[in-house]
């Protein structure tokens, strides 16, 4: 018979060869033969694989680092990787958690409509037309923009979600 | 290398004032956003004041407010917290922090027990 172009779900294609690929939790050991089957052996205590593989080495665990305010969330097993979170009252700085903060600061152009708690980070929203905020902060809003009319000066330069207003005296010479 | 030192913390009646500091270094301290954070024995973080890094701007929790004031002396590198008509519920460790606010940016703090 013609050898394989192709192999099932999970088998792979090796030699001319189809192979079963090793379960999650296994990592290859040798491939098929003719004669013989996939050789798999389970991952180490730390390790894990979470996908039908023919990986030679299994993956570490996730360290969750206490010097970065980490701790375990979920404790890994040999098909799944450690689940990191930070403690009480931290925020992770993003969906992997490998690092924590206090709350995060709200961009320049954005106001904070939300202060941090022990349970939610920092909520920021845009500064809509007519406010700004050229800062970085975990607690300011978005400021409006002077009202030049009001101290009898003319808008000289236009605000910006970013800039306030710059003001400057009325033009004299206007009829 | 990024250090917040604070201090002034200590056993004091209730009613009483203290006054904190923290020492900044290794950084452009006007140009950062401070804040106080303090932690009560068995709780949680609370956030208790924060200020702009050219003092314009302040926040307070609403648990400290016309009791707490927060300053800033950008000359000294030093963050400020007066903290008057102390109770028995401000007794904790409060930190200073900085952004961005990062873990390894935490100090030891300093401990203040109101009791009598």
């Known amino acids: 018979p013609e050898p394989p172009t192709a192999c099932r779900e999970k088998q792979y294609l090796i030699n001319s060869q189809c192979c079963s690929l090793c379960q999650p939790g296994q990592k290859l050991v040798s491939d098929c033969t003719e004669f013989t089957e996939t050789e798999c052996l389970p991952c180490g205590e730390s390790e894990f694989l979470d996908t039908w593989n023919r990986e030679t080495h299994c993956h570490q665990h996730k360290y969750c680092d206490p010097n970065l305010g980490l701790r375990v969330q979920q404790k890994g097993t040999s098909e799944t990787d450690t689940i990191c979170t930070c403690e009480e009252g931290w925020h992770c700085t993003s969906e992997a958690c490998e690092s924590c903060v206090l709350h995060r600061s709200c961009s320049p152009g954005f106001g904070v409509k939300q202060i941090a708690t022990g349970v939610s980070d920092t909520i920021c929203e845009p500064c809509p037309v007519g406010f700004f905020s050229n800062v970085s902060s975990a607690f300011e809003k978005c400021h409006p923009w002077t009202s030049c009319e009001t101290k009898d000066l003319v808008v000289q330069q236009a605000g910006t979600n970013k800039t306030d207003v710059v003001c400057g005296p009325q033009d004299r010479l206007r009829a | 290398e990024v250090q917040l030192l604070e201090s002034g913390g200590g056993l004091v009646q209730p009613g009483g004032s203290l006054r904190l500091s923290c020492a900044a270094s290794?950084?452009?301290?006007?140009?950062?956003e401070m804040w106080w954070v303090r932690q009560a024995p068995g709780k949680g973080l609370e956030r208790v004041s924060a200020i702009s890094g050219s003092g314009g701007s302040t926040y307070y929790a609403d648990s400290v407010k016309g009791r707490f004031t927060i300053s800033r002396d950008n000359s000294k590198n030093t963050l400020y917290l007066q903290m008057n008509s102390l109770r028995a519920e401000d007794t904790a460790v409060y930190h200073c922090a900085k952004e961005p606010y990062s873990y390894d940016y935490w100090g030891q703090g300093t401990l203040v027990t109101v009791s009598s």
């Open positions: 290794g950084f452009t301290f006007a140009g950062y």
